[in-house]
Amino acid sequence: MMTGTIETTGNISAEKGGSIILQCHLSSTTAQVTQVNWEQQDQLLAICNADLGWHISPSFKDRVAPGPGLGLTLQSLTVNDTGEYFCIYHTYPDGTYTGRIFLEVLESSVAEHGARFQIP
């Protein structure tokens, strides 16, 4: 039975040209995290494998940096980066947990962070 929950940074906004950290946290389970995949819609951004390290998709190499932790840093943001991002936790023995973050990249100089929320 999957008992874990994923806490994410929720709905967030950032300025065009700036950077943002995407963070998820898996709690309420003793399952071992084998790998975390970061995806944007159907595109793989990056992988953090617990044993082997990071893989950054070649098309995002210039704008994506590993970390902090299992998180992901997006740099040189454009308006086209607006959309849904998913952290997919591969765990053993529970299976897969998915968290969702919505990022809005703003043209203006004011970007406020949304509140945290949980996905069961």
Partner: antibody, heavy 116, light 107 residues
């Protein structure tokens, strides 16, 4: 005590196949990802492949992708490496190794020789 | 893939000498740098992990330092059992990659 014991090496012709095994003991095998690392005679170390604890995730070095298949049988505490379309440059001692962000336990290795 | 370059490729030293081996990564690897010792006909043995941590049983004369792209393994006082080949390995970016090795020989 953690032990990893490889077997299945030998002499094989180019284009041939071989299956290596690694028997694990001294730890809960099903909780850990495991890798194969090889070393050509007189050369350095090269990571070959990795498999997750449950076997759902695998990675391969570009040099073996499409030719080698890593698998595991947790009920037998055994790791496998199926090697097809072998080339002379696959000649090496093959080690199984475990560890998170490091290889802290290694087997003694099994020698694979690809030659006609 | 990240290239790991060790120097020197070999060195001759005497018992009691202080020995330094360097490893350079082709891009930053944070502190995810491991060192291994290998003796002829044997499997590699982990000496240092994540730059400066020693597994239990590894003597304190072995130490690691550095960060980013440049790392060093130091043997403070070389012992007879330390004559071997030493490899660095990065575990920051997949695939894991090793240096070409440094052979420490008896002078």
């Amino acid at each position: 005590e953690v032990q990893l014991l490889e077997s299945g090496g030998g002499l094989v012709q180019p284009g041939g196949s071989l299956r290596l095994s690694c028997a694990a003991s001294g730890f809960t095998f099903s909780n850990y990802g495991v890798s194969w690392v090889r070393q050509a005679p007189g050369k350095g170390l090269e990571w070959v492949s990795w498999i997750s604890p449950h076997g759902a995730l695998t990675y391969y070095a570009d040099s073996v992708k499409g030719r080698f298949t890593i698998s595991r049988d947790n009920s037998k505490n055994t790791l496998y490496l199926q090697m097809n379309s072998l080339k002379a440059e696959d000649t090496a001692v093959y080690y199984c190794a475990k560890g998170r962000r490091r290889f802290d336990y290694w087997g003694q290795g099994t020698l694979v020789t690809v030659s006609s | 893939d990240i290239q790991m370059t060790q120097s020197p490729s070999s060195l001759s030293a005497s018992v009691g000498d202080r020995v330094t081996i360097t490893c350079r990564a082709s891009q930053t690897i944070s502190s995810y740098l491991n060192w291994y010792q290998q003796k002829p006909g044997k499997a590699p043995k982990l000496l240092i992990y994540e730059n400066n941590n020693r597994p239990s049983g590894v003597p304190s004369r072995f130490s690691g330092s550095g960060s980013g792209t440049d790392f060093t393994l130091t043997i403070s006082s070389l012992q007879p059992e330390d004559f071997a080949t030493y490899y660095c390995q990065q575990s920051y970016i997949i695939p894991p990659t090793f240096g070409q090795g440094t052979n420490v020989e008896i002078k």
